[in-house]
């Protein structure tokens, strides 16, 4: 069967943006008008993991692209990259853990702890245009929680 | 060798609550998770809810307001409570270990435990 | 939830029959469908799982095949010690879900 995925933008609890930052890394900023445009649109699908009554396996591809999000340690810590695949096989139902993210509603919000990684989160920082990143905390500065918008 | 072991009070009060552990070895609690599972005498089988290595639980919706799974990785143990039962929560309960094979064979459940029958009866 | 029609119910054969008991999907589950034997008294054994793999240790007159809603279980020569009763159970997603059972029974 088909993996179920739907197509959304993301924005953090500062109402900051996704854009591609060169080819494999994205951004967090404030955008109006026709640059809303620049956001990125993600294909989130629903896949096997560690489900939860609060926690919804996901995984978060970039629409018509063959690049997912992924969790990886490099230098010794929990990193948040963009991975190339073959289109051939993904999406699919059964993704490699690094590529799934639980994704947890709390009061309309939503966070996306990382599967290979508890406790690390899709994060962004308080600042402009930096990069989307891996964090270990939740409620400190770095923001965590996300709004979803589904487009058509 | 994977062993599970269910224990608890055969015999349980309608309103009281039903309390199970599951003693695991051979495995450990941090890397696999595990179902509870129960059986009517004379009846099919019947998925109650389960914990994951993480700690993470999923509970079936029709006992999901009853329902308590928790653990202590420590002492290889996974407790299941029931509270409010009735005569129809009268089964024999099993616990078994998730398969955990990412990206291959996740939810399927490998090793059980003998099970235990707890009738509920005043 | 996906509901898991079993059948027969029960089922009487012979000592070197060939057997074979089906289970349906209420939706596509691919091939995540698990196969368990249970014997009065006893906790249910996982014979097969994703479908058509034989657990280790597991005789080869076991089998199971299909994938999407329709599965099929089959015993190719039975023997007196695999009078049981059998279920079916999707491993697709939860709530983990089994069908109704067959209890295979001496003719």
């Known amino acids: 069967a088909p993996v179920r995925s739907l197509h959304c933008t993301l924005r953090d609890a500062q109402l900051k943006s996704l854009v591609m930052s060169g080819p494999y890394e994205l951004k967090a900023l404030h955008l109006q008008g026709q640059d809303l445009e620049q956001q990125v649109v993600f294909s989130m699908s629903f896949v096997q993991g560690e489900e939860s009554n609060d926690k919804i396996p996901v995984a978060l591809g970039l629409k018509a692209k063959n690049l997912y999000l992924s969790c990886v340690l490099k230098d010794d810590k929990p990193t948040l990259q963009l991975e190339s695949v073959d289109p051939k096989n993904y999406p699919k139902k059964k993704m490699e853990k690094r590529f799934v993210f639980n994704k947890i509603e709390i009061n309309n919000k939503l966070e996306f702890e990382s599967a290979q990684f508890p406790n690390w989160y899709i994060s962004t920082s308080q600042a402009e245009s930096m990069p989307v990143f891996l964090g270990g905390t939740r409620g400190g500065q770095d923001i965590t929680d996300f709004t979803m918008q589904f487009v058509s | 060798e994977v062993q599970l072991q269910e224990s608890g009070p055969g015999l349980v009060k309608p309103s009281e609550t039903l309390s199970l552990t599951c003693t695991v070895s051979g495995f450990s609690l941090s890397d696999y998770g595990v179902s509870w599972i129960r059986q009517p005498p004379g009846k099919g089988l019947e998925w109650i809810g389960l914990?994951?290595?993480?700690?993470?639980?999923y509970y079936n919706s029709p006992l999901k307001s009853r329902l308590t799974i928790s653990k202590d990785n420590s002492k290889s143990q996974v407790s299941l409570k029931l509270s409010s039962v009735t005569a129809a929560d009268t089964a024999v309960y099993y616990c078994a270990r998730q398969t955990n094979l990412w990206a291959y064979d996740l939810y399927s459940m490998d090793y059980w435990g003998q099970g235990t029958l707890v009738t509920v009866s005043s | 939830d996906i509901q898991m029609t079993q059948s027969p119910s029960s089922l009487s054969a012979s000592v070197g029959d060939r057997v074979t008991i089906t289970c349906q999907a209420s939706t596509d589950i691919d091939d995540d469908l698990n196969w368990y034997q249970q014997k009065p008294g006893k906790a249910p054994k996982l014979l097969i799982s994703?479908?058509?793999t034989l657990r280790p240790g597991v005789p080869s007159r076991f089998s199971g095949s299909g994938s999407g809603t329709d599965f099929t279980f089959t015993i190719s020569s039975l023997q007196p010690e695999d009078f049981a009763t059998y279920y079916c159970?999707?491993?697709?997603?939860?709530?983990?879900?089994f069908g109704q059972g067959t209890k295979l029974e001496i003719k």
């Open positions: 994703l479908g058509s």
């Open positions: 159970l999707q491993s697709d997603r939860l709530p983990l879900t």
């Open positions: 914990i994951w290595g993480g700690g993470d639980t």
